[in-house]
Interface confidence: low
């Protein structure tokens, strides 16, 4: 079943995926689209990179890490509630039916009305660690969840923002990555 | 081919404006980030300012906050520098680049040959 | 703002030595730190990116790495098209900052 990740309508939503390229430069294509991963490609592609590039997405569907490094988490800007549902990223490893498939779950809720002196993500894990990313915007403190044996799937939802930080080289520390090669 | 290409250089008073202009061909500027370099004559290279173009999103150098203005127009793939208020210091090759990896903050693929502003009375 | 402070800020060498130019950051940029190659005249020329990735087209004998908050380029042998400025760039954060360059001339 798929793992669930949840936002609040007009914030971001972050949906992680990643994978470690067997040499540095050596990208394996991967597709984000909309819908549960179907047998092939992907279905109502959003995004998609190629061996070099991120080579085509659509408005507010971004890589904000480094995917050279094979961090493709999707990142949806000012969400609504038409973003609600399953979302697929697929590492398309070469080789017959080889692709790493991954349905993510995405549960959009109405935005609080209670204003707070701070933008709060909702987490589901506990936060035992504080940490500040740096973003495009003003710098927000994000909450990141222990990481235990998890798979690929099933990491804490992560800052908006999350780039070529620490905390990218934590996660990928931790073992939550699909290996290539 | 991807290519750059500065205009829009050249002397100007100090207190004055120029517009510079960086054509991009090759490549689409909504799908990257473009940034604007500059290097004064015999010196090193200072960042001035970025813009991710579909979304609008600027940043600036301390040095030309307020004074200086990035746009894009998409439709024309090309991207541009107001400098207002210019002053000596501004004195320098400005060249565009193209952000690399797909976000603001890295490193430059590819760079226009540069168009050379003097401010000078 | 992250200052990037790169040395030397000249040296000589022979075609076919080894060079090193090193680059310190004032503060942790993970491993955003990018470098270029700029001729006389011309526009810089992206050589590593991320510390230690070869950009597309640039030959093996350039390579870049990373100890912390120092990183270093590294010529492993020399060639006459060599013979350049070099700069360092962190990429960690706005303001992104070069280093102050490195001018590798002919012995």
């Known amino acids: 079943s798929e793992v669930e990740y949840r936002a609040e309508v007009g914030q971001n939503a972050y949906l992680p995926c990643f994978y470690t390229p067997a040499a540095p430069g050596n990208l394996v294509p991967v597709c984000w689209g909309k819908g549960a991963c179907p047998v092939f490609e992907c279905g109502n592609v959003v995004l998609r990179t190629d061996e070099r590039d991120v080579n085509y997405w659509t408005s507010r569907y971004w890589l904000n890490g480094d995917f050279r490094k094979g961090d493709v988490s999707l990142t949806i800007e000012n969400v609504t509630l038409a973003d609600s549902g399953i979302y697929c990223c697929r590492i398309q490893i070469p080789g017959i039916m080889n692709d790493e498939k991954f349905n993510l779950k995405l549960v959009i809720k109405p935005a609080k009305v209670t204003p707070a002196p701070t933008r709060q993500r909702d987490f589901t894990a506990a936060f035992p660690r504080m940490l500040t990313t740096r973003g495009h915007g003003p710098a927000e403190t994000q909450t990141l969840g222990s990481l235990p044996d998890i798979n690929l799937t099933q990491i804490s939802t992560l800052a908006n923002e999350l780039r070529d930080s620490r905390l990218a080289n934590d996660l990928r520390d931790s073992g939550a990555t699909i290996r290539i090669g | 081919e991807v290519q750059l290409v500065e205009s829009g250089g050249g002397l100007v008073q100090p207190g004055g404006s120029l517009r510079l202009s960086c054509a991009a061909s090759?490549?689409?500027?909504?799908?990257?980030?473009i940034h604007w370099v500059r290097q004064a004559p015999g010196k090193g290279l200072e960042w001035v300012a970025g813009?991710?173009?579909?979304?609008?999103?600027?940043e600036y150098a301390d040095s030309v906050k307020d004074r200086f203005t990035i746009s894009a127009d998409t439709s024309k793939n090309t991207a541009y520098l107001q400098m207002n208020s210019l002053r000596a210091e501004d004195t320098a090759v400005y060249y565009c680049?193209?952000?690399?990896?797909?976000?603001?903050?890295?490193?430059?693929?590819?760079w226009g040959q540069g168009t050379l502003v003097t401010v000078s009375s | 703002d992250i200052q990037m402070t790169q040395s030397p800020s000249s040296l000589s060498a022979s075609v076919g030595d080894r060079v090193t130019i090193t680059c310190r950051a004032s503060?942790?940029?993970?491993?955003?730190v990018a470098w270029y190659q700029q001729k006389p005249g011309k526009a810089p020329k992206l050589l590593i990116y991320?510390?230690?990735f070869l950009y597309s087209g640039v030959p093996s004998r350039f390579s870049g790495s990373r100890s912390g908050t120092d990183f270093t380029l590294t010529i492993s042998s020399l060639q006459p098209e060599d013979f350049a400025t070099y700069y360092c760039q962190q990429h960690y954060t706005t303001p992104p900052t070069f280093g102050q360059g490195t001018k590798v001339e002919i012995k």
């Open positions: 090759g490549f689409n500027i909504d799908r990257y980030y």
């Open positions: 813009i991710t173009p579909v979304r609008g999103y600027t």
């Open positions: 680049a193209r952000g690399y990896v797909y976000r603001m903050w890295d490193s430059y693929d590819y």
């Open positions: 503060q942790d940029v993970n491993t955003a």
């Open positions: 991320s510390a230690s």
